[in-house]
């Protein structure tokens, strides 16, 4: 029932994701399924509004990040992405594309330097970065 | 619903070690980090560090880099802190606290420390 | 590490009067703020998050505000049970650090 994927341009090691649709999905054609969402790692270079843009186009958004239990193979990613986490001037606070507030619960953010947008990094990091950078992002959908 | 119960009171030695326990219950202990906190008599709140139960990742108040070790036993619930190479300056009251989503939205009810010979 | 400035360090005042508290953080904390009331021989409780949201059951006199580096918490029309200490707190990045508390004591 359980294959156990090495995506080695994507993960740090073996993550486990399930075979069958039934237990996972429907989702996109060759996006990644895991514990009820969707998930595809977009290689090219684009900058936090392009690659907002390109989720919607998918229907999709781009990642947020909401449980460390059901994502936590978000754990094991590689490198850094673009996530759906910007900073909003007007209520100094940063939040996710659907409005909500993050959590310091589910991120630790680490200001490496100024900008209004955040990167996804390895065991639930979230780096801050000019929205206006290029950088590979991660595209997200739930299933329920 | 959420309780956070802490070890009893210690009287130590200097130079001796104490560890404290903090057992929680009513809520999914792996999802929000726990924190501790220290009261010396008379005196502020002070942040010592807090741990991640999902995969205990720990970040400390520098002060407390050499003082403090946080731990945590998922299987029971709980988590520690182990003070080391005590003084009278660690006499205090140390409270653990679970991190909310935005806030220390419950603590414990604290464990005195005195330290004397 | 960002450090949280609070003042006063202490307080008098009467029932019925509004206070101010106020918490000046040495960098940008994004609203990331707590205020936490403590009563002698207490642990503390919340008292508003993310800098304005009052938390559960503490009553509308309270209200946060601020954004950026700077923020206070007002009481309006003190009753006798608000009397104690209060610390402002942040959640900004990897340390999280408590002010030195104001202690609001009965004129």
């Known amino acids: 029932i359980w294959s156990a994927v090495f995506l080695n341009s994507l993960f740090n090691q073996e993550v486990q994701i399930p075979l069958t649709e039934s237990y996972c999905g429907p989702c996109p054609k060759n996006w990644i399924c895991y514990k009820n969402n969707c998930y595809q790692f977009f290689d090219e270079s684009k900058n936090w509004y392009e690659s907002q843009a390109s989720c919607m186009s998918q229907n999709a958004s781009l990642l947020k990040v909401y449980s460390k239990e059901d994502q936590d193979l978000l754990k094991l990613v590689k490198s850094y992405h673009w996530m759906g986490l910007v900073h909003i001037p007007t209520n100094g606070s940063w939040q996710w594309e659907d409005g909500s507030i993050l959590s310091p619960n589910l991120l630790t953010i680490i200001e490496m330097q100024k900008g209004d947008c955040a990167l996804y990094a390895s065991s639930f990091k979230g780096y801050i970065e000019n929205c206006s950078t290029p950088n590979t992002y991660i595209c997200m959908q739930r299933t329920v | 619903q959420v309780q956070l119960q802490q070890s009893g009171a210690e009287l130590v030695r200097p130079g001796a070690s104490v560890k404290l326990s903090c057992k929680a219950s009513?809520?999914?202990?792996?999802?929000?980090?726990m924190n501790w906190v220290q009261q010396r008599p008379e005196q502020g709140l002070e942040w010592i560090g807090r741990?991640?139960?999902?995969?205990?990742?720990?970040h400390y108040n520098q002060k407390f880099k050499d003082k403090a070790i946080l731990t945590v036993d998922k299987s029971a619930s709980t988590a520690y802190m182990q003070l080391s190479s005590l003084t009278s300056e660690d006499s205090a009251v140390y409270y653990c606290?679970?991190?909310?989503?935005?806030?220390?939205?419950?603590w414990g009810q604290g464990t005195t420390v005195t330290v004397s010979s | 590490d960002i450090q949280l400035t609070q003042s006063p360090a202490s307080l008098s005042a009467s029932v019925g009067e509004t206070v101010t508290i106020t918490c000046r953080a040495s960098?940008?904390?994004?609203?990331?703020l707590a205020w936490y009331q403590q009563k002698q021989g207490k642990s503390p409780q919340v008292l508003v998050y993310?800098?304005?949201t009052l938390a559960d059951g503490v009553p509308s006199r309270f209200s946060g505000s601020g954004s950026g580096t700077q923020y206070s918490l007002k009481i309006n029309s003190l009753q006798p049970e608000d009397f104690g200490s209060y610390y402002c707190?942040?959640?900004?990045?990897?340390?999280?650090?408590f002010g030195g508390g104001t202690k609001l004591e009965i004129k």
């Open positions: 009513g809520y999914t202990f792996t999802s929000y980090w």
């Open positions: 993310n800098a304005k």
């Open positions: 960098g940008n904390i994004h609203n990331y």
């Open positions: 707190q942040h959640f900004w990045s990897t340390t999280w650090t």
């Open positions: 606290a679970k991190m909310g989503d935005y806030s220390f939205d419950y």
């Open positions: 741990i991640d139960p999902y995969d205990s990742e720990t």
